[in-house]
């Protein structure tokens, strides 16, 4: 035979071709071997003219002989060398993949290597290479973009050759709070649009709570715990619904002083005030804001202030929250009765946003004494709160 | 022990100035509004000025505004009043008072005062 | 301006009887009002905020009450110690303005 050529290498099979020697033959003697693997000899038909070699080894240097014979007689020898391909990675695996980061794992080729080339692109055509050394079998990737769909291929090396490349294709988680204990978080998420979100305090998936984030004031983030705007919700309520809460959270409502409680104990957390009255506004924010459990009936903390509505908070800084059934605060009458609400109530308040709605009588009304005194009930007010420290979070998610 | 020690009162001729001082101690002095008070011999009491604990509001009395500006340092511990254009009926013993809150409220503290006589 | 409005002046009382000053204010202040002792050459003494509450140290015999416009300081049995003169201030907006004064003397 003439011509002995070698075809579709692969790490483990190639296929012989020859031209047939121009005598008619009875068979074909093929053998082949490479260093440290033993030769194998297979005998084929005298008409065949193609022969295909398995179970080869990857990465190595194979000689191929092949002879004709006709009875007692056989022809000369002809030789050929190939060389199979690197073998490629196994099972590449995308683990523990978060909103930035995730781990690639892959297991070894047979064939001993010098390294790996990984690479991985997002849909939106950023690709980042990386050279990893022979002994590794997992890379942690980072700065990965939330949300996003990605392709990681890995390739062996050794020296000049090159494996075929194998992928996997993982999607980063969409948020990088997967449970946001407050608005702060849904924002940071990519949350922009003001409206109901579910937080989840301490960050628990079991603590669901369905909450109205402005998004907007400020640079957003924000909690509203008490909106005033049309009097359609009675405010003046028990001790046990200013705990639990009430009202429609898109609407005119109350969060709850048992979700404040829960809410400022995961952390420090600012308060703002905004008001509203006849295209006049005006606010107030206290960096420091806090309320305490049940068992201090729900003690106000707040310090710090800055606006424009006047601070009329400090007045009732170290108070504990008073309803008309249950007086904590430091008057002889009942605050919370006497003008038709429920706060954090001293002897009684400069600040009186759970008042009777549209009430101009002395006191009775939605009052912020330093912006609109008590005789005039503010047609406008939300109670809002988020961590202090939140244009530190909001410029670490900027630059990453 | 909370303490407040005025100084910087005198005798002083009409329409002359003077500076009133304050020393505090035995608190946390930028979480309080600080006050000035005076008292006319033989007379009842009249708030002068007050600011709050930041600083950023002051207050005053009608008889006093403009003539008269109060300040604070608080790294200093220190309240002051500057008093222009003195009148003979600012003659009083003026008293350093401190709030219960940051805001103004209620007087809870007091100093013992400096006496100012406008006279010629 | 909100005026206060103190009465009686003068109040000459023997020791251990009940002693009470009223407070007018001009204007509605809910239960900003505060009460002060001040004993001839010595600075005012805070005894009664928020109307009601006692200052801590002050003895129990001190008591405040009212709410709005009218408002009453009362002293059960009067001490010899308690010979002084009494102000009320309304702390409800400024400028912060003062009675003129109660002076409770012996009688």
């Known amino acids: 035979p003439s011509g002995l050529v070698t075809a579709n290498i692969t790490d483990s099979e190639a296929l012989a071709r020859w031209q047939p020697a121009i005598a008619t033959v009875d068979s074909y003697v093929i053998s082949y071997t490479g260093e440290k693997v033993p030769e194998i000899t297979r005998t084929v038909s005298g008409n065949t003219v193609e022969y295909a070699l398995t179970d080869l080894e990857p990465a190595t240097e194979y000689t191929l002989r092949i002879f004709a014979e006709k009875g007692p007689q056989k022809s000369s020898t002809i030789t050929a060398k190939f060389t199979t391909d690197l073998d490629s990675p196994r099972d590449l695996t995308a683990t523990e993949v978060q909103s930035e980061t995730a781990l690639l794992t892959w297991r070894p080729p047979r064939a001993s290597v010098t390294g790996y080339l990984l690479v991985y692109e997002s849909v939106d055509g950023t690709v980042k290479e990386v050279i990893v050394g022979p002994d590794t079998t997992s890379y942690s990737l980072a700065d990965l973009s939330p949300s996003t769909h990605y392709t990681a291929k890995i390739q062996a090396l050794n020296g000049p050759l090159r494996s075929n490349m194998i992928q996997t294709i993982f999607t980063t988680i969409g948020l990088l709070y997967p449970f946001p204990k407050d608005c702060s978080q849904a924002m940071l998420n990519g949350d922009t649009t003001s409206g109901l979100y579910t937080i989840y305090l301490n960050g628990d998936k079991a603590e669901a709570l369905e909450v109205f984030c402005d998004m907007t004031s400020d640079g957003g983030g924000w909690i509203v715990f008490l909106r005033r705007k049309n009097g359609r919700e009675n405010f003046y309520q028990n001790w046990k619904a200013y705990a639990a809460g009430f009202g429609d959270r898109r609407e005119e409502f109350w969060l709850g002083l048992d979700n404040l409680n829960k809410i400022t104990a995961q952390g420090q957390y600012e308060l703002r005030v905004d008001l509203r009255d006849h295209g006049e506004t005006a606010f107030a924010v206290y960096d420091k804001f806090s309320v305490g459990d049940a068992k201090t009936r729900y003690k106000l903390k707040v310090e710090g202030y800055s606006g424009t509505a006047g601070d009329s908070m400090a007045y009732h800084n170290g108070r504990s929250f008073s309803t008309f059934d249950k007086d904590t605060d430091s008057a002889i009458t009942n605050c919370a009765l006497s003008y038709k609400g429920a706060f954090w109530y001293r002897n009684c308040h400069r600040v009186n946003l759970m008042g009777r709605y549209g009430d101009n009588n002395h006191s009775q009304g939605v009052n912020w004494f330093h912006w609109k005194g008590h005789e005039h009930s503010i047609q406008f007010a939300e109670m809002k709160l988020r961590p202090s420290n939140f244009r530190n979070l909001e410029g670490r998610r900027k630059r990453a | 022990e909370v303490q407040l020690v005025e100084s910087g009162g005198g005798l002083v001729q009409p329409g002359r100035s003077l500076r009133l001082s304050c020393a505090a101690s035995g608190f946390t002095f930028d979480d309080y509004a600080m006050h000035w008070v005076r008292q006319a011999p033989g007379k009842g009491l009249e708030w002068v000025s007050g600011?709050?604990?930041?600083?950023?509001?002051?207050y005053y009395a009608d008889s006093v505004k403009y003539r008269f500006t109060i300040s604070r340092d608080n790294a200093k511990n220190s309240l002051y009043l500057q008093m222009n254009s003195l009148r003979a009926e600012d003659t009083a013993l003026y008293y350093c008072a401190k709030d219960i809150s940051a805001v103004p409220d209620t007087f809870d503290i007091w100093g013992q005062g400096t006496m100012v006589t406008v006279s010629s | 301006d909100i005026q206060m409005t103190q009465s009686p002046a003068s109040l000459p009382t023997p020791v251990g009887d009940r002693v009470t000053i009223t407070c007018r204010a001009s204007q509605y202040i809910q239960g900003f009002l505060n009460w002060y002792q001040q004993k001839p050459g010595k600075a005012p003494k805070l005894l009664i905020y928020?109307?009601?509450n006692l200052e801590t140290g002050v003895p129990s015999r001190f008591s405040g009450s009212g709410s709005g416009t009218d408002f009453t300081l009362t002293i059960s049995s009067l001490q010899p110690e308690d010979f002084a003169t009494y102000y009320c201030?309304?702390?409800?907006?400024?400028?912060?303005?003062f009675g003129q004064g109660t002076k409770v003397d012996i009688k």
């Open positions: 600011i709050s604990g930041s600083g950023g509001s002051t």
């Open positions: 928020d109307a009601s």
């Open positions: 201030q309304q702390s409800y907006s400024t400028p912060q303005t």
